[in-house]
Amino acid sequence: MAVTACQGLGFVVSLIGIAGIIAATCMDQWSTQDLYNNPVTAVFNYQGLWRSCVRESSGFTECRGYFTLLGLPAMLQAVRALMIVGIVLGAIGLLVSIFALKCIRIGSMEDSAKANMTLTSGIMFIVSGLCAIAGVSVFANMLVTNFWMSTANMYTGMGGMVQTVQTRYTFGAALFVGWVAGGLTLIGGVMMCIACRGLAPEETNYKAVSYHASGHSVAYKPGGFKASTGFGSNTKNKKIYDGGARTEDEVQSYPSKHDYV
């Protein structure tokens, strides 16, 4: 019962986590304009992994996709890759874990097979969560570096009365969503791995068999042979994911009245 609960909870937590990773990856607020000196601004800038947006005080928002692939910073590309790998692994993990759930009966699937699948999905969730946390952390580090660089250069090029204030960017909501989601996926994965230990058959009991030989009557009683879980040996058909990662440049979305608080 506890195993089923642990497995089920692990699955639900991972599902929420992966949904969060997908949400974070799609969100536009990875970095937002720093409003420390000016809490009310007429033009507010924010950027995501796929496009950058400008919200005007008039309420209009204009977003532009990053039309280039090669012209983008390597760090941004790395973050994109980490998040996509995290989503792909998480999605496969979810698919595997559905079939591994103890509460779901699929034909005459043995407990050892379910244990293997639970462990596989658990590992996938752990790696998925780590990818998301790594991706978000890399982006956050990039922001911190750029923040202090732009702070140092903030009033450079000041000629007479004319000021050129550089726009500084700080952590956006997507970073926090990503960290939390990555953490949840990681926790879900650990729970699946824990559940897997309980799913593995602990003991194989053999029924007593009587052999009647001439002159002797010997009864062989059941012995306490430990069952071999053999996680590595009895993996049958490993699923191979053909990613075919498509990169789609977003078309410019025309300015639209955007609900904002």
Partner: antibody
Framework: EFQLQQSGPELEKPGASVKISCKTS????????MNWVKQSNGQSLEWIGH????????TYNQKFRGKATLTVDKSSSTAYMQLKSLTSEDSAVYYC???????????WGQGTTLTVSS | DIVMTQSPSSLTVTAGEKVTMSCKSS????????????LTWYQQKPGQPPKLLIY???TRESGVPDRFTGSGSGTDFTLTISSVQAEDLAVYYC?????????FGSGTKLEIK
């Protein structure tokens, strides 16, 4: 057709308060911010502030904070500006204007002339 | 507050002539996020409210004749009327739309000989 119809001219005594209205038609009132602009005796223009009719959030020019209060009535698609503790300095033409792309003002009311005199 | 300085304060030209007026801001009006300059030009004819001519420094409002052209970036902006018509008699204002409070220039009065 878009229209911003402002209330008629006002003659007020110093120390009094006045409420100017701006009735809109022809567009979604809550979809666009409403700005208020002051023009003293044919001189330059001064931005007083704006209001987002959807969230009823306001942003004021520091100079007019405490002097002007911006409100809206969504049911009648009307924006209001109340000016209090009037002095002769407040004598001017007041315009309401709708926000557009680039924070520009694309449609303007015809203006309300306020005269403060004892 | 951003200070907007317009020059000249008044201008007298003959119909058909090309005219340029300048507007300078005390701070850059360029937004790196969308590569746009938040400067607007208005035309105010006597006894009328101002009329939007150009926003984002160079984008002409629909219905505005193409003889009106806005240019410039950062802190220096120009409004050009390629061939002045009698109906262009007005005061022209530039406005900072980049940061609060929105501020206007003192205006350039265009008179026709």
């Amino acid at each position: 057709e878009f229209q911003l119809q402002q209330s008629g001219p006002e003659l007020e005594k110093p120390g009094a308060s006045v409420k100017i209205s701006c009735k809109t038609s022809g567009y979604s009132f809550t979809g666009y911010n409403m700005n208020w602009v002051k023009q003293s005796n044919g001189q330059s223009l001064e931005w007083i502030g704006h209001i987002d009719p959807y969230y009823v959030t306001t942003t004021y020019n520091q100079k007019f904070r405490g002097k002007a209060t911006l409100t809206v009535d969504k049911s009648s698609s009307t924006a209001y500006m109340q000016l209090k503790s009037l002095t002769s300095e407040d004598s001017a033409v007041y315009y309401c204007a709708r926000s557009f792309y680039g924070n520009a003002f694309d449609y303007w009311g015809q203006g309300t002339t306020l005269t403060v005199s004892s | 507050d951003i200070v907007m300085t317009q020059s000249p304060s008044s201008l007298t030209v003959t119909a058909g002539e090309k005219v340029t007026m300048s507007c300078k801001s005390s701070q850059s009006l360029f937004n790196s996020g969308n590569q746009k300059n938040y400067l607007t030009w208005y035309q105010q004819k006597p006894g009328q409210p101002p009329k939007l001519l150009i926003y984002w420094a160079s984008t002409r409002e629909s219905g505005v004749p193409d003889r009106f052209t806005g240019s410039g970036s950062g802190t220096d902006f120009t409004l050009t009327i390629s061939s002045v018509q009698a109906e262009d008699l007005a005061v022209y204002y530039c406005q900072n739309d980049y940061s609060f409070p929105f501020t206007f220039g003192s205006g350039t009065k265009l008179e026709i000989k």
